[in-house]
């Protein structure tokens, strides 16, 4: 035997051809390409999917497999018949020719055919196993689908029942809401009536408070006047006693009395025995000119002459040079005592300056300068300060060295701008400097990011406008 070839026919089927001398034996075997390889996701011994396959797909694949099986069975039958027929013919030929080597060829062919048949049978067994596996899976899936359907039906029934319950509950709640609405309308009506009554009451109370405030101011003024009268009377009695004792002339006695009740500052008032805070009349040094000032007799031992106060925004501080010179406002409230008086006073002896500050959050701080004086008007009431202590910043918020005083009509600052016009109020502006206690008064919640407010930079920063400020002076030797 010369050779053994394996090839494909025109329709793609496998064919085995044995050539022996002049004889050629060709065997056509059934095709198995429709049977998927083990790499296919549908083969039983491949890794199975987690989710079940689509039911229709599974049925379709089952039908395909059945068709393949039928094909294979038919091929096998054909093959058996073919082998039997050929065997008969070959046996006759062998008997006729009785050639030894031909028999050997036939035995080989038979062996090949048997091997081929065994292979086909094994493949068919495989396919059967796959089909069985697929069928079992489909049965399981069908069972799962059936269970799922039952479960869904039960859920739908439960939900329907729940919806009915909710509808009943909703109807009940709607009724309740309607009842409540009626009650609410009645309540609102009564609240509105109460509100109107309260408004009337508040208006009355406001009127009473205003009247009381007026009375309080009057009482304060009267109190100060009475204190002064009491002091005058004490002095008069004292003078009379002295006059009787020494038999001095009445004229000298009354002159002494007049000298005694002249106060230069609040320290004088305090030393005279008048230790109640309030408004007192002070006399300019070396002059008969008078001014009214508020004396603080409580803070740090008392004797403080108040030269500035801000507390409620009731007084406009955007004033002229002349107004800042002589002073303005109410000494018991917001006011500026007057640059001329302060200048004359602080040039007589050494004074300390205390600045008391309050923010909108309830915090308080102070700056104390151990030496303070103002130059005369000729030098634009320039401020001079030395020796800072206190809680309102380690650095002075009044620029050092001191600057001239500026007002809206007297621009004495170091800015290309007009600080007094820009920031409002009269102050010892630099360019324009870290402070201005005479700026615009801004109420709470409107007091930030304001560069023309009441500013003390080294305590509250740039744009914070303070709630209250007091500037007061006292002799350094008090």
């Amino acid at each position: 035997y010369s050779n053994f070839r394996k090839s494909m026919d025109s329709v793609g089927r496998k064919q085995y051809q044995v050539q022996h001398g002049s004889c050629s034996y060709t065997f056509l075997l059934p095709e198995t390409d429709n049977c998927r390889s083990s790499s296919s996701p549908y083969v039983s011994n491949a890794v199975q999917r987690d989710a079940p396959l689509d039911y229709d797909d599974s049925v379709h694949r089952l039908q395909v497999l059945e068709s393949i099986m039928e094909n294979n069975t038919q091929w096998l039958m054909k093959l058996e018949n073919y082998i039997q027929d050929n065997m008969k013919k070959e046996m006759v030929e062998i008997q006729q020719n009785a050639v030894q080597n031909q028999t050997a060829v036939m035995i080989e062919i038979g062996t090949n055919l048997l091997n081929q048949t065994a292979e086909q049978t094994r493949k068919l067994t495989d396919v059967e196993a796959q089909v069985l596996n697929q069928t079992t899976r489909l049965e399981l899936q069908l069972l799962e689908h059936s269970l799922s359907t039952n479960k869904l039906e039960k859920q739908i029934l439960d939900q329907t029942s729940e919806i009915n319950k909710l509808q009943d509950k909703n109807s009940f709640l709607e009724k309740k809401v309607l009842d409540m609405e009626d009650k609410h309308i009645v309540q609102l009506q009564s609240i509105k009536e109460e509100k109107d009554q309260l408004q009337v009451l508040v208006s009355k109370q406001n009127s009473i408070i205003e009247e009381l405030e007026r009375q309080l101011v009057t009482a304060t003024v009267n109190n100060s006047a009475l204190q002064k009268q009491q002091h005058d009377l004490t002095e008069t009695v004292h003078s009379l006693l002295t006059m009787i004792a020494t038999s001095s002339s009445a004229k000298n006695s009354f002159a002494a009395k007049e000298e005694q009740i002249t106060f230069r500052d609040c320290a004088d008032v305090f030393r005279s025995g008048l230790t109640t805070s309030g408004i007192y009349t002070l006399t300019f040094p070396n002059s008969t000119e008078e001014t009214k000032a508020y004396c603080d007799m409580e803070t740090g031992g008392g004797g403080w002459t108040t030269i500035q106060r801000r507390e409620d925004g009731s007084v406009d501080f955007q004033r002229t040079w002349k107004e800042y010179k002589v002073g303005f406002g109410n000494p018991s409230g917001e006011h500026w005592l007057g640059n001329e008086f302060v200048s004359q006073l602080t040039n007589q002896q050494r004074y300390v300056l205390k600045i008391h500050l309050r923010d909108w959050e309830g915090n308080e701080a102070y700056s104390l300068y151990e030496h303070f004086y103002l130059s005369s008007e000729e030098f634009n009431y320039r401020i001079h300060l030395k020796g800072l202590t206190g809680t309102a910043g380690k650095i002075s918020s009044i620029s050092q060295p001191g600057n001239d005083f500026s007002t809206k009509d007297a621009d004495n600052d170091k800015c290309i701008c007009k600080c007094s016009q820009m920031l409002t109020g009269g102050w010892w502006f630099d360019a324009c400097g870290p402070s201005n206690l005479n700026g615009m008064y801004y109420p709470q919640r409107q007091n930030t990011n304001k560069f023309n407010g009441i500013k003390w930079y080294y305590w509250k920063g740039s744009g914070y406008s303070l709630k209250a400020t007091t500037m007061m002076i006292r002799p350094a030797d008090f």
């Epitope: 800015c415 290309i416 701008c417 007009k418 600080c419 016009q421 820009m422 920031l423 630099d430 360019a431 324009c432 400097g433 870290p434 990011n449 560069f451 023309n452 930079y457 740039s462 744009g463």
Partner: antibody
Framework: QVQLVESGGGVVQPGRSLRLSCAAS????????MHWVRQAPGKCLEWVAV????????YYVDSVKGRFTISRDNSKNTLYLQMNSLRAEDTAVYYC????????????????WGQGTLVTVS | EIVLTQSPGTLSLSPGERATLSCRAS???????LAWYQQKPGQAPRLLIT???SWATGIPDRFSGSGSGTDFTLTISRLEPEDFAVYYC?????????FGCGTRLEIK
């Protein structure tokens, strides 16, 4: 005499960086907020950024946020503008300017201004 | 942001004449926080007016500012040859600070 002198301008490619400087003299630098203002050729003036006198507060125009950084060295009396990820639209003359009022930072007028430095992004 | 619109874009006048420059804001400028600047070619802007009407130091009184709310005016009573330049308005009432695009004052 109050003076501001800018430097650091030049031609730069898009996406690259540049740092501008502004040397101040003739005034108490630590008391003033400082600004950068720019002017594109033949266009309007545009405020760019401000830094407070202490250097703790900084504000920028939206178009440069995240790309430009304003800073100052009070010991050297110098203001800086670090410009990253530059774009063609950043081409302009950059001026440094002092606030008109000291001890204030943010909303203010400007006086004086520097002579400007040209930045070309191309 | 507040947009400032300046008009006219260009104003052609002769020396000695009166110039009126307008600056209109898209919303009210609180506190009249408006400044005016003069800019000559190749130079930095120079401050003229702050607070809508206050002269900066050293500015001649022929320059005057007025207005409040949304309408502001810069007036030059008698034009001098050195007054021909570009004039800008700037608001510092709300963030961000904004400028107008300028009015060019040229010799007729």
């Amino acid at each position: 005499q109050v003076q501001l002198v800018e430097s650091g301008g030049g031609v730069v490619q898009p996406g690259r960086s540049l740092r501008l400087s502004c040397a101040a003299s003739g005034f108490t630098f630590t008391n003033y907020g400082m600004h950068w203002v720019r002017q594109a050729p033949g266009k309007c003036l545009e405020w760019v950024a401000v830094i407070s006198h202490e250097g703790n507060n900084k504000y920028y125009v939206d178009s440069v946020k995240g790309r430009f950084t304003i800073s100052r060295d009070n010991s050297k009396n110098t203001l800086y503008l670090q410009m990253n990820s530059l774009r063609a639209e950043d081409t302009a003359v950059y001026y440094c300017a002092r606030e008109g009022i000291d001890f204030w930072s943010g909303l203010n007028w400007f006086d004086p201004w520097g002579q400007g430095t040209l930045v070309t992004v191309s | 942001e507040i947009v400032l619109t300046q008009s006219p874009g260009t104003l052609s006048l002769s020396p000695g004449e009166r110039a009126t420059l307008s600056c209109r804001a898209s919303q009210s400028i609180t506190g009249s926080y408006l400044a005016w600047y003069q800019q000559k070619p190749g130079q930095a802007p120079r401050l003229l007016i702050t607070g809508a009407s206050s002269w900066a130091t050293g500015i001649p009184d022929r320059f005057s500012g007025s207005g409040s709310g949304t309408d502001f005016t810069l007036t030059i009573s008698r034009l001098e040859p050195e007054d021909f330049a570009v004039y800008y308005c700037q608001q510092y009432s709300s963030s961000p600070i904004t400028f107008g695009c300028g009015t060019r004052l040229e010799i007729k």
